[in-house]
Interface confidence: low
């Protein structure tokens, strides 16, 4: 009689994570008597996956009724596959004894697991940067298999070319991670811009995953200042305005100085938003020129988003305004309004 053969017809089986995998195994004879066991890996460190005789294997079921005496099909189904299940599975026939002894092994079936990459997570720099500066964004995605993967960067739909990508580990693994760093040059119009990291993988069936970062979290657009003297509102009163334009983010503190002395400090509140996402704000100072003997240097000093202050000055010629007799007090008002 021909000697028993253990036949594993599939050299490999590939499934997606979360699915079930069937590993086929048949024997050609009922003799010798003895159980079948399934192992992952070979050699002394092999892992028992299923034992026909005993044990609790909750994710493994037999495909056929292996308890029947004449059964020669010992195929198994493994449910809820994860990347950790990847490896080569062996169907092994044992000869009944005390103890049972290994008789013959099948050639093995390699189980490969297709696992989707996690949603790409895009991180920007820790501190804000100003236009014309180059900033780095990182994109990470994990847990995918097989190793082949494509990553692209976009800014507002335009593909970026200045980036470096690594897939780890370099050797064989049950799953992989990708890490990419892109360099982006900021412009003044980038408050509404987005940087997108796009990952394409065989498991995604042509529908790539995207991670995004809003440049509004990264950019700081410094303001431009303009100090102007408005027409006289009343005799001896001059209205001076400080236009603070095109800044982002909104956090801004403005200080009026008269001849170097602090007159008033206020925080930007009622701002207007430009189409590009930057803000405008206007503050005004009402100066009673009769309170001054000499010319007045008015300075609008702005501290934006914790950065060093910038300022713009305006010289107010007192001599050009008639002095009110007997006036020796400064009657100054400040305020802000929407532009």
């Amino acid at each position: 009689e021909e000697e028993l053969q253990v036949i594993q017809p599939d050299k490999s089986v590939s499934v997606a994570a979360g699915e079930s995998a069937i590993l086929h195994c048949t024997v050609t004879s009922l003799i010798p008597v003895g159980p079948i066991q399934w192992f992952r890996g070979a050699g002394p460190a092999r892992e028992l996956i299923y034992n026909q005789k005993e044990g609790h294997f909750p994710r493994v079921t037999t495909v056929s009724e292996s308890t029947k005496r004449e059964n020669m099909d010992f195929s198994i189904s493994i449910s809820n596959i994860t990347p950790a299940d990847a490896g080569t599975y062996y169907c092994v026939k044992f000869r009944k004894g005390s103890p049972d002894t290994e008789f013959k092994s099948g050639a093995g079936t390699e189980l490969s697991v297709r696992a989707k990459p996690s949603a790409p997570v895009v991180s920007g720099p820790a501190a804000r940067a100003t236009p014309q500066h180059t900033v780095s964004f990182t994109c990470e995605s994990h847990g995918f298999s097989p190793r082949d993967i494509t990553l692209k960067w976009f800014k507002n739909g335009n593909e970026l070319s200045d980036f470096q990508t690594n897939v780890d580990p370099v050797g064989e693994s049950v799953s992989y991670s990708i890490h990419s760093t892109a360099k982006v040059v900021l412009t003044r119009e980038d408050v509404h811009s987005q940087v997108i990291c796009e990952v394409a993988h065989v498991t995604l069936q042509g529908d790539p995953l995207r991670g995004t970062a809003n440049l509004s979290e990264t950019i700081r657009v410094p303001p431009t200042l303009e100090v102007t003297q408005q027409p006289v509102r009343a005799e001896n009163q001059v209205n001076v305005t400080c236009q603070v334009r095109k800044f982002y983010p909104q956090r801004l503190q403005l200080t009026w100085l008269e001849n170097g002395n602090v007159s008033r400090t206020e925080t930007a509140s009622t701002v207007t938003e430009n189409k590009d996402g930057t803000y405008n704000w206007m503050s005004w100072l009402l100066v009673n020129v009769s309170a001054h003997r000499d010319d007045v240097k008015l300075t609008c000093q702005v501290e934006h988003d914790g950065q060093p202050a910038v300022s713009k000055s305006h010289d107010l010629k007192v001599s050009a305004h008639p002095k009110e007799q007997g006036s020796n007090t400064a009657a100054e008002n400040t305020g802000s309004n929407e532009r």
Partner: antibody, heavy 118, light 107 residues
Framework: QVQLVQSGAEVKKPGSSVKVSCKAS????????IHWVRQAPGQGLEWMGW????????NYNQKFNGRVTLTADKSTSTAYMELSSLRSEDTAVYYC???????????WGQGTLVTVSS | DIQMTQSPSSLSASVGDRVTITCQAS??????LIWYQQKPGKAPKLLIY???NLPGGVPSRFSGSGSGTDFTLTISSLQPEDFATYYC?????????FGQGTKLEIK
Amino acid sequence: QVQLVQSGAEVKKPGSSVKVSCKASGYTFTSNYIHWVRQAPGQGLEWMGWIYPGDADTNYNQKFNGRVTLTADKSTSTAYMELSSLRSEDTAVYYCAINYGGIWFAYWGQGTLVTVSS
Amino acid sequence: DIQMTQSPSSLSASVGDRVTITCQASQDIGNKLIWYQQKPGKAPKLLIYYVTNLPGGVPSRFSGSGSGTDFTLTISSLQPEDFATYYCLQYKQNPLTFGQGTKLEIK
């Protein structure tokens, strides 16, 4: 100022679909994510997904098993959320919300009550 | 998915009390956390963004702190209009997830 105005309350039969609209004004419609969030009676908030009207890119909460479809009409600055195969547990207030100036969920619509009942 | 666990789920307090609500993420979310206030029949209102920042119009008695996985919302001196339900939200990764809410009631 930024405003999100949602369509009125709906009563639907189980198995049918509902389409809720969210009309945006006061900002550049194509430049901000629009999220959809729902809240069942007396319950917490649950994110359903987002759409980026600029390129119609979407991302969905897989919990909804493909029952949610988000779309946006740039010509009318209106976003839509369609939920199919309705069941009684889909009875909820559905909100649209936008990211604005880098702040997520900065502005919300007033909500649309969808009641699923046979 | 990232789980957001708020505690307590409900809280009774009096006007003038200092109140603290915590939110714990099941994994590191950095600073991608927002707090909302919701009153019955109304849409949620943004209260604090990027963990600590108050948008315009939110009183300074509200403050936020934390990073990584543990976050706190503090109301330094409760006012009558503060009695509402408060939610945290993480937007570090999809799906975006909210805490289950903390209902703040008058004692």
